[in-house]
């Protein structure tokens, strides 16, 4: 009876189990009753990083110098190229497809440490009593206004993104 499932590193085709191609190789032809799966190594600047039945290898990523990218680790037949940014610049994502001078901290967060040539901006959430209402790469969280020192009272509570709103004290008639 033909199999309905195959072992690890195999695949089911034409009611039989064929071996997958190993990383770094692509499928040329499926196995038959009489022949093994035929695989070929990926070409220069190509890769496949899993056991596979792909008929085409993937192109290595291009680290575009016009976007500030350079090669951090050269690709092999089994691994993709890893890009990083020029000195002083930082990847916009884990995939590092473009470079930014430094990231900013969103409202509700303040800058704990300004970016340097080697480290990106470090943000921290504004604690109770502090706020930030801007996106910034240098501004810390600011303390809420002290209404009491202005002889006023809090009319609207502050948040991590907004200052308190002060107003006049109610006068007794």
């Amino acid at each position: 009876e033909p199999p309905t499932a195959c072992r690890e590193k195999q695949y089911l085709i034409n009611s039989q189990c064929c071996s997958l191609c190993q990383p770094g190789q692509k499928l040329v032809s499926d196995c038959t009753e009489f022949t093994e799966t035929e695989c070929l190594p990926c070409g220069e600047s190509e890769f496949l990083d899993t056991w596979n039945r792909e008929t085409h290898c993937h192109q290595h990523k291009y680290c575009d110098p016009n976007l500030g990218l350079r090669v951090q680790q050269k690709g092999t037949s089994e691994t993709d190229t890893i890009c990083t940014c020029e000195e002083g610049w930082h990847c916009t994502s884990e995939a590092c497809e473009s470079c930014v001078l430094h990231r900013s901290c969103s409202p509700g967060f303040g800058v704990k440490q300004i970016a340097t040539g080697v480290s990106d901006t470090i943000c921290e959430p504004c604690p109770v009593g502090f706020f930030s209402n801007v996106s910034s790469a240098f501004e810390k969280c600011h303390p809420w206004t002290s209404c009491e020192t202005k002889d006023l009272v809090v009319q609207q509570a502050g948040t991590n993104k907004t200052d308190v709103v002060c107003g006049p004290q109610d006068r007794l008639r």
């Epitope: 016009n66 976007l67 500030g68 940014c85 020029e86 610049w89 916009t92 473009s98 470079c99 930014v100 001078l101 430094h102 990231r103 900013s104 801007v134 996106s135 910034s136 790469a137 240098f138 501004e139």
Partner: nanobody, 116 residues
Framework: EVQLLESGGGLVQPGGSLRLSCAAS????????LWWVRQAPGKGLERVSA????????YYADSVMGRFTISRDNSKNTLYLQMNSLRAEDTAVYYC?????????RGQGTLVTVSS
Amino acid sequence: EVQLLESGGGLVQPGGSLRLSCAASGFTFAGYELWWVRQAPGKGLERVSAINPQGTRTYYADSVMGRFTISRDNSKNTLYLQMNSLRAEDTAVYYCAKLPFMFDDRGQGTLVTVSS
């Protein structure tokens, strides 16, 4: 399209002064934090100074504190950097930047050379 055009660089003797300008277009100038950054020959990028959208808060790198002053004129869409007591180590190409400053957003910059 965002455009930032730096000017005002040149050759100056140690101890001298220069005022850099950055004319901006293609975005709402008054809504953005702006930076001056510089790149010395063969070195990485250094963050020099920053200013908030209203011009009320500023940042200076330790290396320029007390010598450089950043300012902006939102009515003219222009950012400035007044550089006094210039030193040889201030020699660099100076760029202005808005957040987020992508690598391919860079203008041509303006070259400041401090030499006797």
